[in-house]
């Protein structure tokens, strides 16, 4: 079974900069999975942000503008990354990755 690790416990960024979060997949080939990213803001329910499927198809939360969150995967390091562009106060949250084994 697949296992996920998010090596960064926390990330502190200056406003308007870019934050890059990592999710390391083990126990399964990342190219045979879909990786989903969610966020949980303080006092709010968890929210789907973006996913990248086994075939590279990206799906995003319809309410968030294109260009805000960018998901990628690097098979060589078995890592999925979530890039948050133009960091703002409303991006303060806990971010989770999740795995769907195809």
């Amino acid at each position: 079974a697949g296992h996920l690790e998010q090596p960064q416990i926390s990330s502190t960024k200056t406003l308007s900069k870019t934050a890059r979060l990592e999710c390391v997949v083990s126990g399964i080939t990342i190219s045979a999975t879909s990786v989903y990213w969610y966020r949980e803001r303080p006092g709010e329910v968890i929210q789907f942000l973006v996913s990248i499927s086994y075939d590279g198809t990206v799906r995003k939360e319809s309410g968030i503008p294109s260009g805000k969150f960018e998901v990628d995967r690097i098979p060589e390091t078995s890592t999925s990354t979530l890039t948050i562009h133009n960091v703002e106060k409303q991006d303060i949250a806990t971010y989770y990755c999740a795995l769907w084994e195809v």
Epitope: R59, S62, P65, G67, H85, N86, Q90
Partner: antibody, heavy 121, light 108 residues
Framework: EVQLVESGGGLVKPGGSLRLSCVAS????????MDWVRQAPGKGLDWISS????????FYADSVKGRFTISRDNAKNSLYLQMNSLRVEDSAVYYC??????????????WGQGTMVTVSS | DIQMTQSPGTLSSSPGERATLSCRAS???????FAWYQQKPGRAPRLLIY???SRATGIPDRFSGSGSGTDFTLTISRLEPEDFAVYFC?????????FGGGTKVEIK
């Protein structure tokens, strides 16, 4: 049918103001981020602004920052672009656009017909 | 900002011929966030390709996209009369979203 219809374009003098509207139908407008893209006559496409479904994320191109304001009224299924301090170089067809199919990852698959803005003295 | 440069500016071809359009990004772009659009005079753009190589719904299979990093290609295997139009590339992975200047495919 999923549809976007823009209005509000016209002729305005440099330094003037104009408010564009885009009315959406055929989908749950309040669930979707929306964008404005413009095209000067005979030129390419220029993205100018985005707004999230709840208006908490708003982005602008540098060329319009401080002059244009994007907003929306989900109760009226409407998107707006308030354009102030207009310049001759703002003359263009203005389109509202939307990434409707979630499989497309954010590419714009729904476009309005456009509304023409001409800035001239 | 990521600049997108398309070439050639104009491509003169005949129906039935193969057309190859190029788009180069000023910095690496994830192929998952790369699109091609077609625009005819007086009309809004129409999405052809998303994710660099996936055809949007209803797009004929004579249109294909490829590429990664900074270099992307749109190929029209056999030009039909309705394919003569202007084509734009776009990156939509990071704001500001940016488009190429366009390639006009005209009848020779």
């Amino acid at each position: 049918e999923v549809q976007l219809v823009e209005s509000g374009g016209g002729l305005v003098k440099p330094g003037g103001s104009l408010r564009l509207s885009c009315v959406a139908s055929g989908f749950t407008f309040s669930d979707y981020a929306m964008d404005w893209v413009r095209q000067a006559p005979g030129k390419g496409l220029d993205w100018i602004s985005s707004i999230s479904s709840t208006s908490n994320y708003i982005f602008y191109a540098d060329s319009v920052k401080g002059r244009f304001t994007i907003s929306r009224d989900n109760a009226k299924n409407s998107l707006y672009l308030q354009m102030n301090s207009l310049r001759v170089e703002d003359s263009a067809v203005y389109y509202c656009a939307n990434s409707y199919n979630w499989n497309y990852g954010g590419a714009f698959d729904i476009w309005g017909q456009g509304t023409m803005v001409t800035v001239s003295s | 900002d990521i600049q997108m440069t398309q070439s050639p500016g104009t491509l003169s071809s005949s129906p039935g011929e193969r057309a190859t359009l190029s788009c180069r990004a000023s910095q690496s772009v994830s192929s998952s966030y790369f699109a091609w659009y077609q625009q005819k005079p007086g009309r809004a753009p129409r999405l052809l390709i998303y994710g660099a190589s996936s055809r949007a719904t209803g797009i004929p299979d004579r249109f294909s996209g490829s590429g990664s990093g900074t270099d992307f290609t749109l190929t029209i295997s056999r030009l039909e009369p309705e394919d003569f139009a202007v084509y734009f590339c776009q990156q939509y992975g990071r704001s500001p979203l940016t488009f190429g200047g366009g390639t006009k495919v005209e009848i020779k």
